[in-house]
Amino acid sequence: KSSNEATNITPKHNMKAFLDELKAENIKKFLYNFTQIPHLAGTEQNFQLAKQIQSQWKEFGLDSVELAHYDVLLSYPNKTHPNYISIINEDGNEIFNTSLFEPPPPGYENVSDIVPPFSAFSPQGMPEGDLVYVNYARTEDFFKLERDMKINCSGKIVIARYGKVFRGNKVKNAQLAGAKGVILYSDPADYFAPGVKSYPDGWNLPGGGVQRGNILNLNGAGDPLTPGYPANEYAYRRGIAEAVGLPSIPVHPIGYYDAQKLLEKMGGSAPPDSSWRGSLKVPYNVGPGFTGNFSTQKVKMHIHSTNEVTRIYNVIGTLRGAVEPDRYVILGGHRDSWVFGGIDPQSGAAVVHEIVRSFGTLKKEGWRPRRTILFASWDAEEFGLLGSTEWAEENSRLLQERGVAYINADSSIEGNYTLRVDCTPLMYSLVHNLTKELKSPDEGFEGKSLYESWTKKSPSPEFSGMPRISKLGSGNDFEVFFQRLGIASGRARYTKNWETNKFSGYPLYHSVYETYELVEKFYDPMFKYHLTVAQVRGGMVFELANSIVLPFDCRDYAVVLRKYADKIYSISMKHPQEMKTYSVSFDSLFSAVKNFTEIASKFSERLQDFDKSNPIVLRMMNDQLMFLERAFIDPLGLPDRPFYRHVIYAPSSHNKYAGESFPGIYDALFDIESKVDPSKAWGEVKRQIYVAAFTVQAAAETLSEVA
């Protein structure tokens, strides 16, 4: 059969027709439309936007577009009882208070329903005490404080700067250290790039700007009250005391003007080294407490936010496949924002909208994809990936049997320097081949391919002439699909130059200043980077849904498995005596990786040679490719993290945003020298090697000839 059995457009023009239909001007128009008012999860405004998107996707030509609603736990500030932090004197009088809201950006002064900065899911409380500065509140920062500096955070309020790791990990670390409250702030060292003006004159964070965000430690659970199951009409909900991942101490975020007032009085220990100093004109003393003249003053938090079960709405659009309608390629990104969502998420949602429009145009001309494409506008991502996770829990049986791939579509830009891709190794070759066919939007690369500019600006650390592709971590809606269900996943966006810009994320992330104007004036006036991201995301979806043989290369998994095995072995070999004492061997893992490599190589050879006109054999080979990612799922999950089930990748236990390879072994080895029972600890390392080796071997066998 021709490669075009699902369509009446000539094969070689399929992808071209789809890509040519994507227009920067449309993405710009959609972004403007999506960013004029706040679309906070659980609000009427976001429900109205869901209905608008449903209506427009129908107009664009999708076969069906439905709303899927769930009743999940969300968190909001108390409108009449604002959250703030005070410095109090010995009489308990408040001598300084942090801001109650951000100064609104020009043109938005009269917009209602701008949620003030808060840490979503913080418990209520009014703790008061001495302050301890804990740098980024990473695991290693608390090790430095407790082990090296002998500073006890128990009963203290800690102040930590945003950046480096997910804020929920910071709060978890502070709780474990015994803190009774956490203040999060944005330091100019991390959120103010040198030589750039503050918003509205540039893309830097002003002193009154504050990063919102949730502080959960869900570990993939979704709605905290219904872990593992959808939060539907007949759901059984846990009590709040049994909810998953909620913080136990009050937490509140502030900007650097307010942070200056808290940090300038800090006394106690000096910072241990320069890596603990930010860019404020303060000593960055660790504390505890204020210096001499101010030693009787304390810090008091006033947190009155409430957790409420609230209805959320996903929009799910379907474009039915002509040949394999029971195989699903999913393109999803969230719709809910903290405020205007100029970058997060609407720069992504606008791209999805244009991709849907382009697919719809082709469909109206008589074309259909080979496989079914599902489009999703997720709700409540900012509150813990709730919309995507609940939908996947509700549809898990279908997804695990039919899910080919998931492409994520949150923010299209976090800079305008080069492409950034995180994906399963199965998609490496797809991404390479696609970017070689796309034009680079970068200055100085006119007439060159995206692959070329990307490789030049972001080279692979291992393979010369190839671009860097990173591991998937979490902190976005692909999590449930990849980490829980084992569906091959990927994400792409334009990013900053990490070499020259050391700040974390982009400066205005989750602030009121993330507006349409931020994008249109400073990041992408021509929307050429948005268009490129649309071409990459849309092109991946097109190929995954339309190619006769799935565009997965299992040999690339073999390569990374060897790399990850080498890495974890070298970590373990930092303890040669214990490995000998407890007979720790990685032989089984290396043997499994070797077997995987050989079987993957043979499978790839068969893939070149088989009769593609035989639909049964074609389907069989494609199913082996589709189910390979699924084969890395351990139904029992990782220790204490049952919804992280992928044995090769999981979000780091120390930073949800980062991916860790062989996470079970890694966590078993982490800080093993401090474990009270070394025999038990090394026993767990051995067990995790066993699980990993078995899983790799089992996955390899799914690629063997079936009989």
């Epitope: 703030y84 300084f96 208070n97 942090t98 801001s99 109650l100 809201f101 951000e102 100064p103 609104p104 020009p106 002064e109 002003p206 002193g207 009154g208 700007g209 900007g255 003007y257 307010d258 200056q260 007032k261």
Partner: nanobody, 123 residues
């Protein structure tokens, strides 16, 4: 046009009260800290009070602490100064002044002034 217009001044007996107002136009009051500054006859300028853009902090000169209260209504673009227990030494022209920096947490330099309103405390 960016401007500040003060009102509410007048002649008042010692121990009595007066409420000054300042109407802002041409800029978003909600984004800026605001000050009251006064100039007694034949004297230099004296800072009186400051309120942050969001009303979370108020600072006062020692000479007026406990007697004067600065407040603001961002929805109406107005600033107020409630002056109680007035004294003859409070006699001055009172100016409202906009802080230069968006979102400042403490008084900074002023960049926009009103024309002033005269307050005379006399028996």
């Amino acid at each position: 046009e960016v401007q500040l217009v003060e009102s509410g001044g007048g002649v008042v007996q010692p121990g009595r009260s007066l409420r000054l107002s300042c109407a802002a136009s041409g800029f978003p009051l909600i984004s800026y800290g605001m000050n009251w500054v006064r100039q007694a006859p034949g004297k230099g300028l004296d800072w009186v009070a400051f309120i942050t853009y969001d009303g979370s902090n108020r600072y006062y000169a020692d000479s007026v602490k406990g007697r004067f209260t600065i407040s603001r209504d961002n929805s109406k673009n107005t600033l107020h100064l409630q002056m109680n227990s007035l004294r003859p030494e409070d006699t001055a022209v009172y100016y409202c002044a906009k802080d230069r920096i968006v979102g400042a947490r403490v008084p900074d330099a002023y960049d926009i002034w009103g024309q002033g309103t005269m307050v005379t405390v006399s028996s």
